[in-house]
Interface confidence: low
């Protein structure tokens, strides 16, 4: 899916005002600390395109986050604020209730939820360039796509 | 621990330029915006302008473009401002600040100490 | 550019009694931060985001406010709050008020 359209400033509202506090409530009792963030993303559609994979896509040491809180949330902050997005997802939902029924938070999820929160936490300040300020420059040009 | 460490204080004449550094520590340079704001003897502070280690993006005040230049160099984790022009009335302390997303906007949660910059023939 | 007028510009008031500073903004802002100042030291954050109270700043300070004025309450002056506040603003870039002094009277 190409996040491009979303409208990246209602996203950002739907996760300041409850998707960071419900990825806060999973990570409780984890130090801040206790993670590397090794995944990062360049611009918004690229975050949202990371976010998504992390969120929603099974991995080794933690089958399924999707039917957490925030990734709940998120799923339906997408569904509304991304055009499109809701009739792609229809496949991956059924693959999703088939991964996990039952709900066991190892280190590899306390990883995952992690990275997330740096994806988040960088979809949030993109870039000066969508601060409003007709004056920006940017000497790296760091808008790198990358498509999964 | 956070901490911003600027270089020492300068003395320039009318016409010169100043470059300010700013030693970042204690987290990842590249996560968090820099500021520059100053002060000239009692007044109030002045923000100069910010830059986005991350990839360089900056962004000035106008009252100060074309004369100041922030800069990052991230293997060192270091930021600088750079001033040209020099006048008397650019007498003051310098400082750097931390800007981070938090409690829903971005402020200053962390400064360095200052550094004094004294313009006088 | 937003522009922030502090008032009053100083504050003379005794330990024990309650100072009220006001930060008004020229259009209407989100949120405003707070920093105090002591003589020879940087700022330091004291309220983020309107009401939040940075680390360490005790519960006798408060925020409030909303679209073009904001208020810095100490509800008891205690020796150690005597300095100089100033407001910020983030909404379009960043601009500071001018700063109340508190000071003893």
């Known amino acids: 899916y190409d996040f491009t359209n979303c409208d990246f400033e209602k996203i950002k509202a739907a996760y300041l005002s409850t998707i960071s506090k419900d990825l806060i409530t999973y990570m409780s009792g984890t130090k801040s600390t206790e993670f590397n963030n090794t995944v990062s993303c360049s611009n918004r559609p690229h975050c949202l395109t990371e976010i998504q994979s992390l969120t929603f896509n099974p991995t080794a040491g933690c089958a399924s986050l999707a039917k957490e809180m925030f990734a709940m949330k998120t799923k339906a902050a997408l569904a509304i604020w991304c055009p499109g997005y809701s009739e792609t997802q229809i496949n991956a939902t059924q693959a999703m209730k088939k991964a996990r029924k039952s709900k066991v938070t190892t280190n590899k999820c306390l990883e995952q939820v992690s990275q997330l929160q740096g994806l988040w936490r960088r979809f949030n300040r993109p870039l000066l360039k969508q601060q409003g300020s007709s004056d920006y420059k940017d000497d790296d040009d760091k808008h790198h796509h990358h498509h999964h | 621990e956070v901490q911003l460490v600027q270089s020492g204080a300068e003395v320039k004449k009318p016409g010169a330029s100043v470059k300010v550094s700013c030693k970042a520590s204690?987290?990842?340079?590249?996560?968090?915006?820099m500021n520059w704001v100053r002060q000239a003897p009692g007044q109030r502070l002045e923000w100069m302008g910010i830059?986005?280690?991350?990839?360089?993006?900056?962004s000035y005040n106008q009252k100060f473009k074309g004369r100041v230049t922030i800069t990052r160099d991230t293997s060192a984790s270091t930021a600088y401002m750079e001033l040209s022009s020099l006048r008397s009335e650019d007498t003051a302390v310098y400082y750097c600040?931390?800007?981070?997303?938090?409690?829903?906007?971005?402020?200053?949660?962390?400064w360095g100490q200052g550094t004094t910059v004294t313009v006088s023939s | 550019e937003i522009v922030l007028t502090q008032s009053p510009a100083t504050l003379s008031l005794s330990p024990g009694e309650r100072a009220t500073l006001s930060c008004r903004a020229s259009s209407s802002v989100s949120y405003m931060h707070w920093y105090q100042q002591k003589p020879g030291q940087a700022p330091r954050p004291w309220i983020y985001?309107?009401?939040n109270l940075a680390s360490g700043v005790p519960a006798r300070f408060s925020g409030s406010g909303s679209g073009t004025s904001y208020t810095l309450t100490i509800s008891r002056l205690e020796p150690e709050d005597f300095a100089v506040y100033y407001c910020?603003?983030?909404?379009?870039?960043?601009?500071f008020g001018g700063g109340t002094k508190v000071e003893i009277k």
């Open positions: 910020q603003q983030w909404s379009s870039n960043r601009t």
């Open positions: 204690g987290y990842t340079f590249t996560d968090d915006y």
């Open positions: 985001a309107t009401s």
């Open positions: 600040a931390r800007e981070d997303y938090d409690y829903d906007g971005y402020a200053m949660d962390h």
């Open positions: 830059i986005s280690p991350y990839n360089g993006g900056t």
